[in-house]
């Protein structure tokens, strides 16, 4: 498998972590989240060429079959391999609470 | 979130489990796998419209940001939520061995 940064399509074009700034309004959270007002959303974006950051055997199979049957089998997709937690201050029936979300921000990425 | 089978794009067009028949040659395994000669590969294929089989909060965020910035943020992607193990009979330096692979066949799918 190629090194995670050795993108055959050119620097930065393959599956990697990107940060997208989003407001509560952008996320549709304005009615239930108080803080933060803006989130630096880390997400996985980019192409998954052959064996690039292949998550597992399934990703390798997908690559092989996509090469054979590109109209039937999609190429592997760039998705989070793990997440960073994030604490939101949210509105509740009784007032306000602190809540940790485990699956909100991507921590690192792979192809699957 | 919509029910897993309630695809707004039409029956069977959204993220779900598909079976693709593949030979060892198709998979590039002919030189190291003896059996099975053919694999019924289960994989996740299909579109991920808004909130369809959203895996977690991250998938929901991705949907919202894709709607706002379709050229920057891709839509969620249909990937395995879990796997079924599979036993391969493989060639080794000393002969033949049985090996279980845990991450080869998709068991069910979600959008992320």
């Amino acid at each position: 498998a190629r090194n995670g940064d050795d993108c055959p399509l050119g620097p930065g074009r393959c599956c990697r972590l990107h940060t997208v700034r989003a407001s509560l309004e952008d996320l549709g959270w304005a009615d239930w989240v108080l803080s933060p007002r803006e989130v630096q959303v880390t997400m996985c974006i980019g192409a998954c060429p052959s064996q690039f950051r292949a998550a597992n055997m399934h990703a390798q199979i997908k690559t092989s079959l996509h090469r054979l049957k590109p109209d039937t089998v999609p190429a592997p997709c760039c998705v989070p391999a793990s997440y960073n937690p994030m604490v939101l201050i949210q509105k509740t029936d009784t007032g306000v609470s602190l809540q940790t979300y485990d699956d909100l921000l991507a921590k690192d990425c792979h192809c699957i | 979130a919509r029910n897993g089978d309630d695809c707004p794009l039409g029956p069977g067009r959204c993220c779900r489990l598909h079976t693709v028949r593949a030979s060892l040659e198709d998979l590039g395994w002919a030189d190291w796998v003896l059996s099975p000669r053919e694999v019924q590969v289960t994989m996740c294929i299909g579109a991920c419209p808004s909130q369809f089989r959203a895996a977690n909060m991250h998938a929901q965020i991705k949907t919202s940001l894709h709607r706002l910035k379709p050229d920057t943020v891709p839509a969620p992607c249909c990937v395995p939520a879990s796997y079924n193990p599979m036993v391969l009979i493989q060639k080794t330096d000393t002969g033949v061995s049985l090996q279980t692979y845990d991450d080869l066949l998709a068991k069910d799918c979600h959008c992320i």
């Epitope: 108080l34 604490v87 609470s97 | -």
Partner: antibody
Framework: DVKLVESGEGLVKPGGSLKLSCAAS????????MSWVRQTPEKRLEWVAY????????FYADTVKGRFTISRDNARNTLYLQMSSLKSEDTAMYYC???????????WGQGTLVTVSA | SIVMTQTPKFLPVSAGDRVTMTCKAS??????VAWYQQKPGQSPKLLIY???NRYTGVPDRFTGSGSGTDFTFTISSVQVEDLAVYFC?????????FGAGTKLELK
Amino acid sequence: DVKLVESGEGLVKPGGSLKLSCAASGFTFSSFAMSWVRQTPEKRLEWVAYITSGGDYIFYADTVKGRFTISRDNARNTLYLQMSSLKSEDTAMYYCTRDDGYLWFAYWGQGTLVTVSA
Amino acid sequence: SIVMTQTPKFLPVSAGDRVTMTCKASQNVGNNVAWYQQKPGQSPKLLIYYASNRYTGVPDRFTGSGSGTDFTFTISSVQVEDLAVYFCQQHYSSPLTFGAGTKLELK
């Protein structure tokens, strides 16, 4: 090095008031949420109050709500806990803690003892 | 609020022993559990956060595991300096709550 130093300990009568302070150094105080955590004589740990980095959101344990007030002065790098209508069950060692953004307590002061007794 | 039930209350040990203590949350808290060590006369010290992540400088004999409602804290080979009280804490939602503690004492 992160340093948190509590002060204000004392013996107070039930119904009385006391103000605790926590002087912070070794980090950018205004960037971190802070909490007060107390430890009872039976050695039970109880979270008391939490304040966000800018002081815009505040949370209290139900046992102290309406009686205790957490505040901060970012210019002075100091965290406060104003305690009033004190009860004997408020007797505890009070610790100032720094939150690293995930609601666990990464740094603790040495503690300051509050005794509520007639 | 979420109740953290810690067992056992006391754990008699000898140097070199492998010891395990558990913490059970009254509702699902994901991986949001921390473990602290408190030695006599000292303030608590963070050892493990997010169920299994060792905090900076914490020796690898200390490990945490679990998710959902059941969590475990293990010391693979107890050293004399590990004699202390260990507390679990849920950092999932407010009010933040602690277990009652497990005291490690010499047999």
